[in-house]
């Protein structure tokens, strides 16, 4: 039975340029995450954090995303095509998988705000 | 450059265990997970499992769990392989393979240490 | 465990032809997918990684294509030294699994 939750920094905001932080955190469950996956707003993969083995980032965002906090990601050098959800799959023994999901609106205006707070979706 | 040097070829009888050596040079040894890959002969290629020598953390595929065990020393830049109770079917070439900066396709690859196990 | 259908098994094929081999996935594994090129007695060396980047100083000939299950190997023109047996790998989650080769021969 899965009891765990999955908790995210939710709808955020960032200046294009910036960077910003995308975190997930699984909570309520004693099972063990073996692997983290990064997806973007068209399911293509940002980057793998197996457990063990370390980071896997996708050459077509080495320059741009970097590895944690944590199991989290950093975006970096944001554009406006940035702007869209994000997921994060946790894959889970003996649970299964769980996933977040995160909405970035990356901003032209200097007066952006990047709200870190955490929501359940 | 990147170089993986194993150790030579090994006969076993079943029942025993192996311990298969990889030195690497030419890179910071800590910055790379560390694979073993094993081909039985005439088969596909067949993964072991994989290290993490900056933490010693290891990942083994179910098949091999329990039975090969992985390790590093990281003073010198060299990482292990050991199977226990051998037995025929094990009788293959055992690869270590670097796994790339940041990525997990193989990258570097050693020459290779041929397993024999007959009784 | 993710399994790796290559297809085919073996072929044959003149110096200059366009060969091309493919690699089927048992689910989804994104663009989590390597080539690799093994000459007898030798060990694998990589060549296409992430499905379609070419790594450091393999030819042009050699491409990769495709994301999700189905993923597709080109070599645009056949050279001599291209004889070897192929294998496609996921690393999309572990087990990391490989297809069963694709071996290569000259007509």
């Known amino acids: 039975m899965m009891t765990g939750t999955i908790e995210t920094t939710g709808n955020i905001s960032a200046k294009k340029g910036g960077s910003v932080i995308l975190q997930c955190h699984l909570s309520s469950t004693m099972a063990q995450v073996t692997q983290v996956n990064w997806e973007q707003h068209d399911h293509s993969l940002l980057a793998i954090r197996n457990a063990e083995l370390g980071w896997h980032i996708y050459p077509a965002f080495k320059d741009r995303v970097a590895p944690g906090p944590g199991l989290g990601l950093t975006l970096q050098s944001l554009t406006m095509n940035d702007t869209g959800e994000y997921f994060c799959t946790y894959h889970t023994y003996p649970d299964g998988t769980y996933r977040g999901r995160i909405f970035l609106e990356v901003l032209e205006s200097s007066v952006a705000e990047h709200s870190a707070r955490f929501q359940i979706p | 450059q990147v170089q993986l040097v194993q150790s030579g070829a090994e006969v076993k009888k079943p029942g025993a265990s192996v311990k298969v050596s990889c030195k690497a040079s030419?890179?910071?040894?800590?910055?790379?997970?560390m694979h073993w890959v094993r081909q039985a002969p005439g088969q596909r290629l067949e993964w072991i499992g994989g290290i993490n020598p900056n933490n010693a953390g290891t990942s083994y595929s179910q098949k091999f769990q329990g039975r090969a065990t992985l390790t590093v020393d990281t003073s010198a830049s060299t990482a292990y392989m050991e199977l226990s109770s051998l037995r025929s079917e094990d009788t293959a070439v055992y690869y270590c393979?670097?796994?790339?900066?940041?990525?997990?396709?193989?990258?570097?690859w050693g020459q290779g240490t041929t397993v024999t196990v007959s009784s | 465990d993710i399994q790796m259908t290559q297809s085919p098994s073996s072929l044959s094929a003149s110096v200059g032809d366009r060969v091309t081999i493919t690699c089927q996935a048992s689910q989804d594994i994104k663009t989590a997918l390597a080539w690799y090129q093994q000459k007898p007695g030798k060990a694998p060396k990589l060549l296409i990684y992430s499905a379609s980047y070419r790594y450091t100083g393999v030819p042009s000939r050699f491409s990769g294509s495709g994301s999700g299950t189905d993923f597709t190997f080109t070599i645009s023109s056949l050279q001599p030294e291209d004889i070897a047996t192929y294998y496609c790998?996921?690393?999309?989650?572990?087990?990391?699994?490989f297809g069963g080769g694709t071996k290569l021969e000259i007509k």
């Open positions: 030419g890179y910071t040894f800590t910055e790379n997970a």
């Open positions: 790998h996921q690393h999309y989650t572990t087990p990391w699994t």
């Open positions: 393979t670097r796994s790339s900066y940041y990525r997990y396709d193989l990258d570097y």
